[in-house]
């Protein structure tokens, strides 16, 4: 019986080279969270947070992904290729699986910012 709801950060944007926090929150349920999986748009696993074993960051993302805050994930050194959907999957007892979606758009630094950075005083 799925009584809970997943709240996410929704559609977010961040600058290339910067970082972003991906956050999901499960509410309106007494269910116990046993594991949270974070997946990228191509279904590749970024990280798992297991209640027993703690965090596991997958090797391909070790340099750019930091666990937290909470059950969320911090994505660093963003590239244009990071644009796309991200999914959090909550494995809970006794409700089963809940899934949340976040869309991340990575933006190029604006021309104004770019030129300002190279202005000669």
């Amino acid at each position: 019986m799925m009584t809970g709801t997943i709240e996410t950060t929704g559609n977010i944007s961040a600058k290339k080279g910067g970082s972003v926090i991906l956050q999901c929150h499960l509410s309106s349920t007494m269910a116990q969270v046993t594991q949270v999986n974070w997946e990228q748009h191509d279904h590749s696993l970024l990280a798992i947070r297991n209640a027993e074993l703690g965090w596991h960051i997958y090797p391909a993302f070790k340099d750019r992904v930091a666990p937290g805050p909470g059950l969320g994930l911090t994505l660093q050194s963003l590239t244009m290729n990071d644009t796309g959907e991200y999914f959090c999957t909550y494995h809970t007892y006794p409700d089963g699986t809940y899934r949340g979606r976040i869309f991340l758009e990575v933006l190029e630094s604006s021309v104004a910012e770019h030129s300002a950075r190279f202005q000669i005083p």
């Epitope: 019986m1 799925m2 007494m30 269910a31 116990q32 969270v33 046993t34 594991q35 297991n50 209640a51 027993e52 494995h91 809970t92 007892y93 006794p94 409700d95 089963g96 699986t97």
Partner: antibody, heavy 119, light 108 residues
Framework: QVQLVQSGSELKKPGASVKVSCKAS????????LNWVRQAPGQGLEWMGW????????TYVQGFTGRFVFSLDTSVSTAYLQISSLKAEDTAVYYC????????????WGQGTTVTVSS | EIVLTQSPGTLFLSPGERATLSCRAS???????LVWYQQKPGQAPRLLIY???TRATGIPDRFSGSGSGTDFTLTIRRLEPEDFALYYC?????????FGQGTKLEIN
Amino acid sequence: QVQLVQSGSELKKPGASVKVSCKASGYTLTSHALNWVRQAPGQGLEWMGWINTNTGNPTYVQGFTGRFVFSLDTSVSTAYLQISSLKAEDTAVYYCARGYSSPPRMDVWGQGTTVTVSS
Amino acid sequence: EIVLTQSPGTLFLSPGERATLSCRASQSVSRNYLVWYQQKPGQAPRLLIYGASTRATGIPDRFSGSGSGTDFTLTIRRLEPEDFALYYCQQYGSSPFTFGQGTKLEIN
């Protein structure tokens, strides 16, 4: 290995209370939910409810409210079932079982505790 | 609440034969969250199948689960002497998470 070890059999008089313990080993008690299941003599299994071992929040099935209390002592990795104002119809084997997900199931069971209520 | 009806109540078979146990729900079990347990006299139940068709760790492949919606089946392909026991289904589709009344598998 992962196991749940329950306290021994109890013989109680009507009106008395009993506290059944369920000790978890081989895993962290607070990482998985803990269920209680009753089996009356010669009868089937009856799910009594469960306790969120992370928050300590219990959920009771209708028919197991009031006289039944689920609790935890995480310092000794133990869950408890307390039954007060015992009646003859409480005579049963009581099992604790770990809740696992996903999909949900009870994957590890205690050996059961027989509670006999008789005058 | 969802009522689970198991049939037959008792099944008489011989070792080597195939056993087919049925579990019928009074309403559809959400996401096929149906579980099968085995119980032997004087012992705790043992998890066999979850999610209607996934075998639990250490369960021999002669055990298989199938079905969806309201009709579920546990099949034991070639019965071994140790398979003669009680079998219960349980649903996690809707609280309270009810059990069936059980099917007793007896040696013919």
